[in-house]
């Protein structure tokens, strides 16, 4: 089942899925000046069985030179966007990812793909958190979140991670710092851009990956 919401936002932290469960959708989005072809796939789908999973459908973008615009449509200039984006590079795969049955790897980029990837997760999906550069982790528990089904509704577990500035004084043991929820999200906006760098798979952030920088948006 698709998860209704997105993984929780932790101040000064990013999250990433290391593998995608079957049923995960990745919207076919194109970069500026390009559009999804009319009869092209709407999304890629992680599909398969417990022994082998792969991405079904192919995203295709075509030049939108003959763009159909109206006065009312005002494409947002980059600086107007609510969140900054980075150019997407081919993400590096964690070595152990392929051994996860019923999961897909990060799909390869397609020609003229948008800089943001929009995923729709399914129940059972796990994402991992890491503090952004310039912040360090104070752990109370696992720095991960799982989409779970409870009483017919989906919810994400709360990752036990606080990211504090390098220059900030460390908290004393046992001192509770309130877990701030994201503020100022218009109309219950449930999107989150993720830029990952040196993302660690393990909760303890011990095993590091090669740097991969890309941007993802969830719902």
């Amino acid at each position: 089942e698709l998860c209704d919401d997105d993984p929780p936002e932790i101040p000064h932290a990013t999250f990433k899925a290391m593998a995608y469960k079957e049923g995960t959708m990745l919207n076919c989005e194109c970069k500026r000046g390009f559009r999804r072809i009319k009869s092209g796939s709407l999304y890629m789908l992680c599909t398969g069985n417990s022994s082998h999973s792969s991405w079904d459908n192919q995203c295709q973008c075509t030049s939108s030179a003959t763009r159909n615009t109206t006065k009312q449509v005002t494409p947002q200039p980059e600086e107007q966007k609510e969140r900054k984006t980075t150019e997407m590079q081919s993400p590096m795969q964690p070595v152990d990812q392929a051994s996860l049955p019923g999961h897909c790897r990060e799909p390869p980029p397609w020609e003229n793909e948008a800089t943001e990837r929009i995923y729709h997760f399914v129940v059972g999906q796990m994402v991992y958190y890491q503090c952004v550069q310039g912040y360090r982790a104070l752990h109370r528990g696992p720095a991960e979140s799982v989409c779970k089904m409870t009483h017919g509704k989906t919810r994400w577990t709360q990752p036990q991670l606080i990211c504090t500035g390098e220059m900030e004084t460390s908290q004393f043991p046992g001192e509770e710092k309130p877990q701030a929820s994201p503020e100022g999200r218009p109309e219950s906006e449930t999107s989150c851009l993720v830029t990952t760098t040196d993302f660690q798979i393990q909760t303890e952030m011990a095993a590091t990956m090669e740097t991969s920088i890309f941007t993802t948006e969830y719902q």
């Epitope: 698709l2 049923g23 959708m25 919207n27 989005e29 500026r32 559009r35 999804r36 009319k38 009869s39 796939s41 709407l42 999304y43 789908l45 599909t47 079904d56 459908n57 939108s64 763009r67 159909n68 615009t69 109206t70 449509v73 494409p75 947002q76 943001e116 929009i118 729709h120 109309e187 219950s188 906006e189 449930t190 999107s191 948006e217 719902q219």
Partner: antibody, heavy 114, light 107 residues
Framework: QVQLQQSGAELVRPGTSVKISCKAS????????LGWIKQRPGHGLEWIGD????????NYNEKFKGKATLTADTSSSTAYMQLSSLTSEDSAVYFC???????WGQGTSLTVSS | DIQMTQSQKFMSTSVGDRVSVTCKAS??????VAWYQQKPGQSPKALIY???YRYSGVPDRFTGSGSGTDFTLTISNVQSEDLAEYFC?????????FGGGTKLEIK
């Protein structure tokens, strides 16, 4: 929670035009295709066309070209469908829907009558 | 345009029964098929995407299957609240098209 709130029922004269609105909330309006669907008793559901608000790109079902015009206002996260040269054949319930993952508005009833 | 044919306009079933609604595409649409439930006076609600995957909040008694041209929505252990019309839709080729609908009646 994804929500699509459509404008109220319309009673209009033949030969005129009407503009139906669909206000989106709970997701990034500019990042998703939004479609329009016609439902008439005995005629089932018909896909009119769809629009990508982030770029103003549109697709139309050939059957509705010249009849429907799709637009979007990103500042208010609202999509519009204008229907022109109305006849009794245009009397129907019209739905807006986020294309994928699918989520539909409550529908707008249009009655064309003199 | 691709035609989606739901041959049974009406189906009668009893609470607790298992019922299968079928849909046939006029050409191969892969698994790019969705199923919707529409209750009287309401808008369609998405149940299934990609032929067999359930949307959030959809009870697991609803199961989608099929690929290519033949698709089935199975409702096991039918409940009184399942009284509705069910539509299939293909989104493999533009324009996206719907089946004519199957009305489920509870005996």
């Amino acid at each position: 929670q994804v929500q699509l709130q459509q404008s109220g029922a319309e009673l209009v004269r033949p030969g005129t035009s009407v503009k139906i609105s669909c206000k989106a909330s709970g997701y990034t309006f500019t990042n998703y295709w939004l479609g329009w669907i016609k439902q008439r008793p005995g005629h089932g559901l018909e896909w009119i066309g769809d629009i990508y608000p982030g770029g103003g790109y549109t697709n139309y079902n050939e059957k509705f070209k010249g009849k429907a015009t799709l637009t979007a206002d990103t500042s208010s996260s609202t999509a519009y469908m204008q229907l022109s040269s109305l006849t009794s054949e245009d009397s129907a319930v019209y739905f807006c829907a986020r294309v994928t993952p699918a989520s539909w508005g409550q529908g707008t009833s249009l009655t064309v009558s003199s | 345009d691709i035609q989606m044919t739901q041959s049974q306009k009406f189906m009668s079933t009893s609470v607790g029964d298992r019922v299968s609604v079928t849909c046939k595409a006029s050409q191969n649409v892969g698994t790019n098929v969705a199923w919707y439930q529409q209750k009287p006076g309401q808008s369609p609600k998405a149940l299934i995407y990609s032929a067999s995957y359930r949307y959030s909040g959809v009870p697991d008694r609803f199961t989608g299957s099929g690929s290519g041209t033949d698709f089935t929505l199975t409702i096991s252990n039918v409940q009184s609240e399942d009284l509705a019309e069910y539509f299939c839709q293909q989104y493999n080729s533009y324009p996206y098209t719907f089946g004519g609908g199957t009305k489920l009646e509870i005996k």
